[in-house]
């Protein structure tokens, strides 16, 4: 049975040319993560943590995306093609897989602010 | 030309250090991880250990028979990886790879890892 | 760790036979971190086989790899004088890396 919840940074805006962290945490289970999944919302991928191996920054994204904080990722230099959804999937033993959404929005306006509270999806 | 070479190998006493350095060319150093592979006289592969890329802070990993004693590190700027042996053991005599680990992660998020380029080795040998 | 157990130790065979090599694991391995490795006396392995099955750059399509869980194989259709040699597979998940103790193909 599934019993754990995904905790995101639900909504968030940041500037453009600025960075932000997307953050997902699983909760309220003793499941092992074996891989955590970021994937953009044209479903192209970003990154894979691998909890045996590590990240892997997939290549049209090297130069935008760092690994973490945690199993989080940090994508820089956004641009407005970077609004959007993002997800975030913890392949989890023997729980299965967890799912959870943010949504960026991009702005072009000097005073964007950049909100990181934890939302349940 | 893709490459790897192996020096500083040599003849050591049980209780000694000896330092094995790989020097890399024609690839992208920093965004590799990179193997340490033994194979005593007559036997087959051991893997030694491994440092990661730059992407995952070039943390390390060790074999169980090696932890402790040796210690993989590397120099982007050089393109150069190195393997710290210390207190040598008889056990230890081998000729030492180093090899290109390729991590990475298909459209389908199907992980692969294998090591594709191999330097010629280092012999070393731990005797009294 | 997982102990991968390859048979037979030797195969004794001639060129244009085929050849068929196996590697065993203790424990289930997922195909896509298992590969195949040559090498010929003297020299550094050569990667032949990766993900159980995709040739690496410049192989002879006379190899293949095939297999899922705990049994995999290394086939080469058609022995050629060249591929006389030893052969080890290897696994990289989980931890820690390891390899089989190789298949020596010779000359029958």
């Known amino acids: 049975m599934m019993t754990g919840t995904i905790e995101t940074t639900g909504n968030i805006s940041a500037k453009k040319g600025g960075s932000v962290i997307l953050q997902c945490h699983l909760s309220s289970t003793m499941a092992q993560v074996t891989q955590v999944n970021w994937e953009q919302h044209d479903h192209s991928l970003l990154a894979i943590r691998n909890a045996e191996l590590g990240w892997h920054i997939y290549p049209a994204f090297k130069d935008r995306v760092a690994p973490g904080p945690g199993l989080g990722l940090t994508l820089q230099s956004l641009t407005m093609n970077d609004t959007g959804e993002y997800f975030c999937t913890y392949h989890t033993y023997p729980d299965g897989t967890y799912r959870g959404r943010i949504f960026l929005e991009v702005l072009e306006s000097s005073v964007a602010e950049h909100s990181a509270r934890f939302q349940i999806p | 030309e893709v490459q790897l070479v192996e020096s500083g190998g040599g003849l050591v006493q049980p209780g000694g250090s000896l330092r094995l350095s790989c020097a890399a060319s024609g690839f992208t150093f920093s965004d590799h991880y990179m193997d340490w592979v033994r194979q005593a006289p007559g036997k087959g592969l051991e893997w030694v250990g491994r440092?990661?890329?730059?992407?995952?802070?070039?943390?390390?990993e060790y074999a169980a028979s090696v932890k402790g004693r040796f210690t993989i590190s590397r120099d982007d700027s050089k393109n150069s990886l190195y393997l710290q042996m210390n207190s040598l053991k008889t056990e230890d005599t081998a000729v030492y790879y180093c090899?290109?680990?390729?991590?990475?992660?298909?459209?389908?998020?199907?992980?692969?890892?294998?090591?594709?380029?191999w330097g010629q080795g280092t012999t070393v040998t731990v005797s009294s | 760790e997982i102990v991968l157990t390859q048979s037979p130790g030797t195969l004794s065979l001639s060129p244009g036979e085929r050849a068929t090599l196996s590697c065993r694991a203790s424990q289930s391995v997922s195909s896509s971190y298992l590969a195949w490795y040559q090498q010929k006396p003297g020299q550094a392995p050569r990667l032949l086989i990766y993900?159980?099955?995709s040739r690496a750059t410049g192989i002879p399509d006379r190899f293949s790899g095939s297999g899922s869980g705990t049994d995999f194989t290394l086939t080469i259709s058609r022995l050629e004088p060249e591929d006389f040699a030893v052969y080890y597979c290897q696994q990289a998940v989980p931890s820690p890396l390891t390899f089989g103790g190789g298949t020596k193909v010779e000359i029958k």
């Open positions: 090899a290109r680990g390729q991590y990475y992660y298909g459209s389908s998020s199907r992980g692969y890892y294998y090591m594709d380029v």
């Open positions: 993900g159980a099955s």
């Open positions: 440092t990661r890329n730059k992407a995952n802070s070039y943390t390390t």
